[in-house]
Each structure stands twice: as structure tokens, then as C-alpha cells.
């Protein structure tokens, strides 16, 4: 059962796992949600009736029954983790806490003009978890405007105290706002021999990397595969750090793999969701329950639905035994990872999918489909929408992409002459325009947000957001596409597709079926040569074949240039402009979305 409200002047008795310090009860709830075992918490607010050393304590709790006895206590605020809820969860915390000093290791001190600048510095520093900034009014002259960057082993403060004229806050890395590089490569036959901050068991290097990503102190990792010569170290995942933030020591060693935390790209790849099955693999841990199940998929569902289950092992049924049902062992551990991993015993193991909701919805894999030709199939591009105008008559105006449950990203030039959002309709989950009838459901548009530097498509800033009047319920046929991570600026995309209902040639009509074309990206230098009369800026991206023949065209505007990278689709471009359509040596020009991520997040995350 999902309980989101906080219980004032209430304390949960017993079940303590650990105590951390948080600046608010709301953030305590987030910490509890992300902790592998926490189901409930009690937070102590500042209060004259409470011992100041207990202010801001956040006690994380667990219970076999998923609840604990309640006791009345002034200044105590209690609640439940969001693990029990089905809604999307985020660790992003933009709050600034006034007159609070969050204690940690002060590893960097510098002058900053504002708290915002201090927070940005923290966000772009690999080690920083949170900061404290002494304002202009701070009593001590030499400490005024000082920005202290801090880190701790847990990522949360070691203590929080009241201190006049300072403000504190957290790094915004988990809000996708970091400019740090996103290094996705996994290096085979490599050991990083720097300091270990922790070690866990993992079935493969990808899970090890994802564990590193959501571990507060891990910057890179080394994983020993199941072929590693030393049996006691097989499947061992070493979580590592270094002062410089990079490995100082790389040693060639067979059957080991190493890689980096994906903290700076976590919004465009799954980091909590370990969805694979591991065959002939047994996960050991504390047993929660043993239930009969028809398949390993059914076992995973049972684990996902049991709030305390973290991972499972399924042993298939022996022939004609127990109505063909195997045994499903639901398990847990103190850190959410198996305590040991064994191979060759016939089990099939995996993890709960309950944590998938902590990842961005856009990272979910699309069910593979057999596709060919230029017409799309249903559900192939579930982020693609058709934007209609109803004035003077209803017609397709532009394409667009779902990027959030209330947000469509499209091109600014689509709204030339559009006086009001009232005349707009957004249709999602559509394959054929002919599906749209009088009674077809649509999303009304509450607000059109055009980039304030937009003048015309050819001069750039051709980007706009539509805020929908109601939220989109994600399904297989309508869900978001990931924005590229700012740390991904150097990624070379090789699998890019432009989609839309636009013209098939310059003098044509809107197509009934959503069309798709695979188009290679072109460097900006190359693109500039093809458009001597225009300035191709770094905020634009070009795509097209030298010989022409495939391109976006009239009516595709605002739609996505979607590129697949590491099994996840990213919205790399927005169809903007070009000279004619599919002409030889005239690539299509698209708005370069990665350059607008800050703008998008600023507009969509505004309180």
C-alpha cells in the first residue's frame, strides 16, 4: 500500500536500520526510498522541546509486516518509503536550506557570487555531494561568499546544525544538470587498482557499473568475471574512488573488466533497473519466502510485488512435479546485492523490477519488432506525437516528442501565426492520421513555451515546449524519449532515424502512415560547406546522405531525430530546416537538443 503523506508528531517504534541526517522530512523520505531496506522512517524536526543533537536525524527503519507501532512525540515526523508506490521517483533535490550548515568533509573552499553559483560548482565537481555557502551577511568578514564543497561516505551530511546567514543544498547531479563527462565504455581485461570504498557481488560488469552509479562515493569500478582465476573473487564488484576522480592505476589483467560511474548520464540509461535474467546462476541471500511459480518471469513478478524482495533465484520444476511449477526463492540482503553468486546449479536468477521506477521512464527498452521499409509499425516510435491545429480547419501541423508526462518538445517555427494554445491538439500513440476522428482522445495544450532567442528556423533556437493540460499515462504506444546527457556531447551516434507524417517530396501532401528514414549524421564542418549562405552553429546538428534521397520534409518539422545508443533511444535533434527536401548535398538541419538540455530542464522543472 502506497502512503505518501507524512505523519506529524508521530514516531515509529523499533525497526531501526541506521540513522542519517537530512535537512527535511521530505528528503528523509527520499533517502529511505533509495536505501535498499528502508520501508519507514522517523525524522526529528528542530524544536525547543527536542535535544538539538537530535534535530534533523532521519532514522531509517524496516519491518517484516511493513509497519511499526506509532508513538506520539512532538517534533517527530514519520512516513513510508516510496518503494510501495508505483509512481516515478527522483532523487533530484533543488531545495536550498536557509540557516542550516550541513556538515561533511570540506574538501574545497572558494569564493562564489551566489548560492546558485556554489550549487553549480558542486554539481560539476565529481566528489561533491552537498555544499554550504556563507552569504554576504555572514558575521565573519573573511568567510563571506565562501562556497564549501563537501562529501561524505553516505552522500548525506554527518550532522546538521543551525547557523545564521549560511545556506546549504545538494549537488544537482541527480537532476541531469551536471556538465561532467559521461564515460560509458567498459574496459575489458583491465583492473583499476585505486582505493576501494566498498565491494559487492554482481552477476556482470553492467550491474556492477549500475551499482557504482548509485553509490554515493563510487567514481569507477573493477569487476571480476566468473572466469576470474581466483574462485573467492569471482563476481566481485569493487567500487572505487581517487582524489583526482580518475583511476591513477590501470593494470592489464585477463577476465577483469573496469568502467566508470554513469552519474553524469544516469538520466538517459537505466541505473537502478537490472532487468536481465542470469541462467545457471544462483543468488544467495537472506530468504524471504519460497513460492511456487510457473517460470522465471513469474518469479520476477512475485519478487517485484513483494516490497522487501530484492532479488530471486528460480529453480525450474523437475518433470511432472508440482503441476509443472518450479520453486521461486525470494531474497534480500543488507545492501540489495546477493551475498554470494554460484554458477552451475541450474537456477535462474534476477532482481526486483520495483527499482525501475527510480530510473527515467525513457530508458525502458522498446519491445523489438520486425520492421522494414519506410512505413513505421505501431509502437515503434512511442514518443512521436502529431500536433494538430483546429483553425481554420483541423489538420496536422507538426511533429513533436514526448519528453515528460506533461511535456512535448517540438520546433518553435511550428507556431508562426498560432495565436493561442487553445487551437492546438496533441495526439499520441497514433500510427495513421486516418485514426483521428471527432471522438479520438487528445491532449489540450496549456502553454506554448518558445525559446526567447528564437527569430527564424535558419538562425537557430528553433525549439519549443508544449505543456499539456493533462498528464500522459505511459503505455507501450505512448511514452517518453530520453534527452541526451550533457556528458554525452562527444558520443558519435550511428543509428539515427527521422520520423514524421510530412511530405515524401517537395510538392506532396501529408502522409497517412508515420514514415521513418535512417539518416547518417553529418559533421557541422561538412554541413557548413553545403550551406555557405547560413551560419551552422554548434546549437544545430545536420543529417543526410550526400546523394540525397532521404530526408525530413514539410510537415515533419518539430518531430524527432532519434538515435539509439547503448540500447536506449535519445532525442538528438528536432527537425528544423533545410534547402528543399532530400536534395543532393543538402543535409537536413536539426536543433541540437543536447545544447538545450539546461533550458528544457529549467522550463519543465520550474516550481
Amino acid at each position: 500500500e502506497c502512503v505518501t503523506q507524512l505523519l506529524k508528531d508521530t514516531c515509529f517504534e523499533g525497526g531501526d536500520i541506521t540513522t542519517v541526517f537530512t535537512p527535511s522530512a521530505k528528503y528523509c523520505q527520499v533517502v529511505c526510498t533509495y536505501h535498499p531496506r528502508c520501508l519507514l522512517f522517523t525524522f526529528t524536526a528542530e524544536s525547543p522541546s527536542e535535544d538539538p543533537t537530535r534535530w534533523f536525524t532521519c532514522v531509517l527503519k524496516d519491518s517484516v509486516t511493513e509497519t511499526l507501532p506509532r508513538v506520539n512525540r512532538t517534533a517527530a515526523i514519520s512516513g513510508y518509503s516510496f518503494k510501495q508506490c508505483s509512481h516515478q521517483i527522483s532523487a533530484c533535490n533543488k531545495d536550498i536550506y536557509v540557516d542550516l550548515d550541513m556538515k561533511g568533509i570540506n574538501y574545497n573552499s572558494s569564493v562564489a557570487k551566489s548560492a546558485q553559483e556554489c550549487q553549480e560548482r558542486c554539481t560539476d565537481d565529481v566528489h561533491c555531494h552537498f555544499f554550504t555557502y556563507a552569504t554576504r551577511q555572514f558575521p565573519s568578514l573573511e568567510h563571506r561568499n565562501i562556497c564549501l564543497l563537501k562529501h561524505t561516505q553516505t552522500g548525506t551530511p554527518t550532522r546538521i546544525t543551525k547557523l545564521d546567514k549560511v545556506v546549504s543544498g545538494f549537488s544537482l547531479k541527480s537532476c541531469a544538470l551536471s556538465n561532467l563527462a559521461c564515460i560509458r565504455d567498459i574496459f575489458p581485461n583491465t583492473v583499476f587498482a585505486d582505493s576501494n570504498i566498498d565491494s559487492v557481488m554482481a552477476p556482470d560488469a553492467f550491474v556492477c557499473g549500475r551499482i557504482c552509479t548509485h553509490h554515493p562515493g563510487c567514481l569507477f569500478f573493477t569487476f571480476f568475471s566468473q572466469e576470474w582465476p581466483k574462485e573467492s573473487q569471482r563476481n566481485l564488484c569493487l567500487l572505487k574512488t581517487s582524489e583526482s576522480g580518475l583511476p591513477s592505476t590501470r593494470i592489464k589483467k585477463s577476465k577483469a573488466l573496469s568502467g566508470f560511474s554513469l552519474q553524469s548520464c544516469r538520466h538517459s540509461i537505466p541505473v537502478f533497473c537490472h532487468s536481465s535474467f542470469y541462467h545457471d546462476t544462483d543468488f544467495l541471500g537472506e530468504e524471504l519466502d519460497i513460492v511456487a511459480a510457473k517460470s522465471h518471469e513469474a518469479c520476477q513478478k512475485l519478487c517485484t510485488n513483494a516490497v522487501r524482495c530484492q532479488f530471486f533465484t528460480y529453480t525450474p520444476a523437475q518433470a511432472s512435479c508440482n503441476e509443472g511449477k518450479g520453486k521461486c526463492y525470494l531474497k534480500l540482503s543488507s545492501n540489495g546485492s546477493p551475498t554470494k553468486i554460484l554458477h552451475g546449479r541450474g537456477g535462474i536468477s534476477g532482481y526486483t523490477l520495483r527499482l525501475c521506477k527510480m530510473d527515467n521512464e525513457c530508458t525502458t527498452k522498446i519491445k523489438p519488432r520486425i520492421v522494414g521499409g519506410t512505413a513505421s509499425v505501431r509502437g515503434e516510435w512511442p514518443w512521436q506525437v502529431t500536433l494538430h491545429t483546429t483553425s481554420p480547419t483541423q489538420r496536422h501541423l507538426c511533429g513533436g516528442s514526448i519528453i515528460g508526462n506533461q511535456w512535448i518538445l517540438t520546433a518553435a517555427h511550428c507556431f508562426y501565426g498560432v495565436e493561442s494554445p487553445k487551437i492546438l491538439r496533441v495526439y499520441s500513440g497514433i500510427l495513421n492520421q486516418s485514426e483521428i476522428k471527432e471522438d479520438t482522445s487528445f491532449f489540450g495544450v496549456q502553454e506554448i513555451i518558445i525559446h526567447d532567442q528564437y527569430k527564424m528556423a535558419e538562425s537557430g533556437y528553433d525549439i519549443a515546449l508544449l505543456k499539456l493540460e493533462t498528464t500522459v499515462n505511459y503505455t507501450d504506444s505512448q511514452r517518453p524519449i530520453c534527452l541526451p546527457s550533457k556528458g554525452d556531447r562527444n558520443v558519435i551516434y550511428t543509428d539515427c532515424w527521422v520520423t514524421g507524417w510530412g511530405y515524401r517530396k517537395l510538392r506532396d501532401k501529408i502522409q497517412n502512415t508515420l514514415q521513418k528514414a535512417k539518416i547518417p549524421l553529418v559533421t557541422n564542418e561538412e554541413c557548413q560547406k553545403r550551406y555557405r549562405g547560413h551560419k551552422i552553429t554548434h546549437k544545430m546538428i545536420c543529417a543526410g546522405y550526400r546523394e540525397g534521397g532521404k530526408d525530413a520534409c514539410k510537415g515533419d518539422s518539430g518531430g524527432p531525430l532519434s538515435c539509439k545508443h547503448n540500447e536506449v533511444w535519445h532525442l538528438v535533434g528536432i527537425t528544423s530546416w533545410g534547402e528543399g527536401c532530400a536534395q543532393r548535398e543538402r543535409p537536413g538541419v536539426y536543433t541540437n537538443v543536447v545544447e538545450y538540455v539546461d533550458w528544457i530542464l529549467e522550463k519543465t522543472q520550474a516550481v
Epitope: A193, S195, I197, S199, T222, P229, K230, Q233, L236, K253
Partner: nanobody, 126 residues
Framework: QVQLVESGGGLVQPGGSLRLSCAAS????????MAWYRQAPGNECELVST???????YYADSVKGRFTISRDNSKNTLYLQMNSLRAEDTAVYYC????????????????????WGQGTLVTVSS
């Protein structure tokens, strides 16, 4: 009980040499990757050199060309020949087996299957 026992440390003048030894027992030495780490007072644990089971070697930049790691599998012994010693080489030197990195920057704690010796002090001073 796995044991790693270091010897050969002591006081030496700058420019001098020392040879450290590490005698290993109770585990398959020839299948293990061996390493020398060091920790100076108030500093993090630092990897000095490794030698893998198949003979591959690695040296930290600060010791390259001055230190040589070797092993004698028949004697279950690891060596570190240290030449042209400098004051900044002063530290406690630890022998380690299958220990890829130290925990919390401290040369004493192991994860599964990794082992440390108790350390030998090397002091370089005139």
C-alpha cells in the same frame, strides 16, 4: 591461515638501496597476483608495484626505473629491489596478495580473497 610476512626494511641513506622480501604461506602463491603497497604517515595507501601470476609487472610513476618487483614461485616469496632511495620513499611497505586497491585508503583491510602482510618500515634519511 594465510600469512604474508615482510622483511628487509630499515634505515637507509638517500641514494642507498634495500631489498624487501615477502614470504607467503597457506595459499597457492604461483596463481596469485602479488603487490607492494606503501603508506607514509598521514597519507593514503599507495600502490607501488604489482606482478601478476603470469609475470606482468606494473610500477607507479614515482618509482619507475628505481624499483624492481620479482617473485620466486619455488620459494613462495615476493621481492622488491629498491635503488636510488629518496626521503619521500619513507613509509611502511606492505606485501599484498590478490588485493586490487586498498579500502578507505588504508593498507590493512581486505575484500574476499585479498590479503595483506603486517608491513615493514623503510626510513630514508641522512
Amino acid at each position: 591461515q594465510v600469512q604474508l610476512v615482510e622483511s628487509g626494511g630499515g634505515l637507509v641513506q638517500p641514494g642507498g638501496s634495500l631489498r624487501l622480501s615477502c614470504a607467503a604461506s597457506e595459499f597457492t602463491f604461483d596463481d596469485s597476483d602479488m603487490a607492494w603497497y606503501r603508506q607514509a604517515p598521514g597519507n593514503e595507501c599507495e600502490l607501488v608495484s604489482t606482478i601478476t601470476s603470469d609475470g606482468g609487472t606494473y610500477y607507479a610513476d614515482s618509482v619507475k626505473g628505481r624499483f624492481t618487483i620479482s617473485r620466486d614461485n619455488s620459494k613462495n616469496t615476493l621481492y622488491l629491489q629498491m635503488n636510488s632511495l629518496r626521503a619521500e620513499d619513507t613509509a611502511v611497505y606492505y606485501c599484498a596478495a590478490d588485493q586490487w586497491g586498498s579500502a578507505e585508503g588504508d593498507c590493512t583491510s581486505s575484500y574476499p580473497g585479498g590479503y595483506w602482510g603486517q608491513g615493514t618500515l623503510v626510513t630514508v634519511s641522512s
